[in-house]
Interface confidence: low
């Protein structure tokens, strides 16, 4: 039946499209399929193009394979016919449906018999069966050895030799090491095989340029350091460096109108000269803002130092102190002001008294015989000093206080001649304004550190001596040194530092005995607008620490080592910085940047005051800290 | 004026996920948080997170972490809060508030929206 | 978290009376702020930042405080000051409110 239907196929072949001419449809009611009638049409337009009248003998010169139209005809249904399978790796060819399909012959493959089978590559006979080299060839394959080895008599798998017994002298004096089909001269880690002398000598990777700041070398390795003085820590590749960068803006906003009263550390702020008819008293007003509880507003004297007024904070409360021919007087009275909002002072002297109110209310009424400054030549010339006074007026107070105020004043009016002239001056001067925005705390803007003499030495306890930190901290940036003792060998016995974490937006703290991390508590989010609070217990026997997430005694094997460090520098003399290191070695501590952001310290129960510090970097708030700043936005 | 418009109450069973929607209008919606906080009957009030629309940033305090979801919409000035996984003690009144930043209060409030959960 | 304690749970006083709510926070916080409810009504901002009164609330309410210790002072009470009141930190995540204190007619 099927020989039948291909002989009627024929037949209309033959009647449509060759005595006559056919078009597409007519072939395909030859066909009575599309996919045939596709691959037909094509070329029967081929053939009528070759053997049409005027054209044919153009056709017999080309290399057409056919004599006539007839022949040409009848052989495009034949899908083997030019032969399409690779006469290499065919069988057989089989005609089908506008299409064919090749038989391969053993170690070929595709729907043409064109691809070699890469015996060396069948998955259910990895790599041919051989154990080392498989070489692929056209329909067959062999397998070889590398160098090194020798093939054994299956002809499939290798042997290695063994080159340091055969030859034990071939590395010298460096270990010889026998690795499959070769051998190793090894050297520790940080040396090299040098070939020439066959032995191990140092690298020198500093003369490398490994590092990108500074490089440290020593016999087997090396250390890379960057200055974090200057804003820079080590990246994760341990070689360069990057910027110490920002995790947590603060608003950094300042005001020229806000005159800020802690700008020296040391040393008055503004210094003011007043020559006023006789008849003037002594006024001064202005709005107050601060956190701190002790230090001097304002100090007024005569022109010859005879007699003098102080108007400072002491526990928070307005303080006057005052001394003339006729009488010294203290009085401390009113609310506690140092609560970090905008408070209204003003001190007036009045014909029989001086008049202190805060917020227009009266707080103290401190009476005087006669006038506080006396005139001289028709003139009552005066002196003010804001946030301090001449070093020579300590001695002279009738109460010691300590004269460093972190705050700010606005608004001021003295000897009631308005602000006149002191604008301009604090106009020009940055460092003299303030900051709009305050919290409580203590502020390190990275760029400083403060000192402190403190004696951790306890007769009475057993230990000797101890350490026991309670820091609360808002860092505004996620790498820097917090608290180091540091020796006077110039070395740092104890750290607690900061570091940005591998972990992404978190950060790890360090502790760390000379140049050696002694823990790392990982990946804490302290870069946000909350405190965290760190408290550490150190003595030299143990080290404990307490973070928001866990309480923890710290042992290793190496610890007590490293407290045997510690407690032979803590026997000696030990200084506390806060903040960051003072001038030591890069290479004294695994960070040496300065913290950035906001910071209270408490050691051995005592919360450490700023203002009662040996020394601090001017930019260092004692009692103050910038807010958190937040995205403005725009739609 | 500003106003802070909720989506109406809503009846859900143990297990099942109801979403509160919240349109803000009369200002300019990418300049403040929307913070949401709930409040089961007869008790106070209890904070539930906040998304800045200008980013979809979002906090959630710990005790919904993972069960709730803040998300907006801002062509159509709208917040939104999923609370997943409901029982019987989320039955509240949950509400929308306006907050723009450190030192503010939540100063506009939407009127709530009473989500009842119960088999 | 921060927990806040208002006290005391309940005060009854009259018309014309000085309430006085007090608001104490497990840690210190940089502000406090106070809401006002009323039944069937979401809260309103009273205070602000510790001590600044809100839009459209009148004189008679103010707040003050520092540290862990905050107050809210209503100088003579009206008959529409009855209602509860909440304390709220934004200090730490989560933000947290007092319990309450409600205010009623003695």
């Known amino acids: 039946a099927n020989s039948l239907l291909e002989e009627t196929k024929q037949g209309n072949l033959e009647r449509e499209c060759i005595e006559e001419l056919c078009n597409k449809e007519e072939a395909r009611e030859v066909f009575e399929n599309d996919p045939e009638t596709d691959y037909f049409y094509p070329k029967y337009l081929v053939c009528l193009r070759s053997f049409q009248t005027g054209l044919f003998t153009a056709a017999r010169q080309s290399t057409n394979a056919y004599p006539d139209l007839r022949s040409c005809v009848n052989a495009i249904p034949d899908q083997c016919s030019p032969l399409p399978c690779n006469e290499d790796g065919y069988m057989s060819c089989k005609d089908g449906k506008a299409s064919f399909t090749c038989t391969c012959k053993p170690g070929w493959q595709g729907e043409k018999c064109e691809f070699d089978i890469n015996e060396c590559k069948d998955p259910s006979n990895i790599n041919g069966g051989c154990s080392q080299i498989c070489d692929n060839t056209p329909g067959s394959y062999h397998c070889s050895c590398k160098n090194g080895f020798v093939m054994l008599s299956n002809k499939k798998d290798c042997k290695d030799v063994d080159e340091c017994s055969l030859k034990p002298s071939i590395c010298g004096t460096a270990v010889c090491k026998n690795i499959p089909g070769d051998f190793e001269c090894e050297c520790p880690e940080g040396y090299r095989y040098n070939l020439k002398s066959k032995s191990c000598e140092d690298i020198d990777e500093c003369s490398e340029n490994m590092c990108a700041q500074l490089c440290v070398n020593y016999p087997g390795g090396y250390t890379c350091y960057c200055d974090g003085k200057k804003g820079f820590k080590l990246a994760q590749d341990q070689k360069s460096c990057e910027v110490v960068s920002v995790c947590l803006p603060l608003n950094l906003d300042t005001k020229y109108e806000l005159l800020y009263l802690a700008e020296q550390f040391a040393g008055v702020v503004l210094y003011l000269k007043f020559r006023l008819p006789e008849i003037s008293r002594f006024s001064a007003e202005f709005d107050f803002r601060t956190y701190d509880s002790e230090g001097v507003i304002l100090y007024a004297e005569s022109i010859d130092h005879s007699a003098w007024l102080l108007i400072a904070l002491r526990g928070g409360k307005i303080e006057v102190q005052l001394k003339n021919e006729h009488t010294s007087k203290i009085t401390t009275g009113g609310d506690v002001i140092n609560n970090g909002l905008w408070n209204m002072v003003s001190v007036e002297e009045l014909e029989h008294s001086i008049s202190i109110k805060i917020a227009k209310e009266a707080v103290m009424d401190i009476n005087k015989p006669g006038p506080l400054f006396k005139p001289e030549n028709g003139l009552l010339e005066t002196k003010v000093y804001f946030a301090g006074f001449p070093r020579k007026v300590e001695s002279e107070l009738i109460k010691p206080i300590n004269p460093r105020l972190d705050g700010c004043i606005r608004s001021w009016n003295l000897m009631k001649q308005g602000a006149s002239g002191i604008k301009e001056i604090i106009q020009e001067k940055q460092n003299k304004h303030c900051l709009v925005t305050v919290e409580k705390g203590s502020y390190y803007p990275g760029s400083g550190i403060a000192q402190f003499h403190i004696d951790y030495n306890n007769v009475s306890s057993a230990e000797g001596w101890h350490v026991n930190v309670t820091l609360n901290i808002r860092p505004s940036t996620g790498t820097g040194v917090m608290l180091a003792l540091v020796s006077g060998n110039n070395t740092v016995p104890f750290a607690v530092s900061l570091v940005d974490s591998t972990s992404e937006k978190s950060q790890d703290i360090l502790l760390s005995v000379e140049n050696t991390v002694i823990y790392r508590i990982q990946a804490l989010s302290l870069c946000s607008d909350q405190q965290s609070h760190l408290e550490f217990r150190v003595n030299r026997n143990n080290l404990e620490l307490s973070t928001p997430l866990k309480i923890e005694t710290i042992s290793h094997e190496d610890l007590q080592r490293q407290l045997a460090v510690l407690d032979k520098a803590m026997k000696a003399k030990v200084a506390t910085y806060l903040g960051g290191l003072p001038d030591v070695p890069f290479s004294a501590t695994p960070v040496n940047a300065f913290y950035n952001g906001c910071m209270e310290v408490n050691i051995n129960g005592v919360q450490l005051d700023l203002d009662e510090a040996i020394s601090k970097h001017n930019d260092i708030r004692a009692h103050s800290c910038p807010s958190v700043w937040k995205k403005t936005k725009n739609s | 004026q500003v106003q802070l418009v909720q989506s109406g109450a809503e009846v859900k069973k143990p297990g099942a996920s109801v979403k509160v929607s919240c349109k803000a209008s009369g200002y300019t919606f990418t300049s403040y948080w929307i913070n949401w906080v709930r409040q089961a009957p007869g008790q106070g009030l209890e904070w539930m997170g906040r998304?800045?629309?200008?980013?979809?940033?979002?906090h959630y305090a710990q005790k919904f972490q993972g069960r709730v979801t803040l998300t907006r919409d801002k062509s159509t000035s709208t917040a939104y809060m999923e609370l997943s996984s409901l029982r019987s003690e989320d039955t509240a009144v949950y509400y929308c508030?306006?907050?723009?930043?450190?030192?503010?209060?939540?100063?506009?409030w939407g009127q709530g929206t009473t989500v009842t959960v119960s088999s | 978290e921060i927990v806040l304690t208002q006290s005391p749970a309940t005060l009854s006083l009259s018309p014309g009376e000085r309430a006085t709510l007090s608001c104490r926070a497990s840690?210190?916080?940089?502000?406090m702020y106070w809401y006002q409810q009323k039944p069937g009504q979401a809260p309103r901002p009273l205070i602000y930042?510790?001590?600044n009164l809100a839009s459209g609330i009148p004189a008679r309410f103010s707040g003050s405080g520092s540290g862990t210790d905050f107050t809210l002072t209503i100088s003579s009470l009206e008959p529409e000051d009855f209602a509860v009141y909440y304390c709220q930190q934004w200090s730490s995540i989560p933000p947290t409110f007092g319990g309450g204190t409600k205010v009623e007619i003695k």
């Open positions: 930042a510790t001590s």
């Open positions: 998304i800045d629309p200008y980013d979809s940033e979002t």
């Open positions: 508030a306006r907050w723009g930043g450190s030192g503010y209060a939540m100063d506009y």
């Open positions: 840690s210190s916080v940089s502000y």
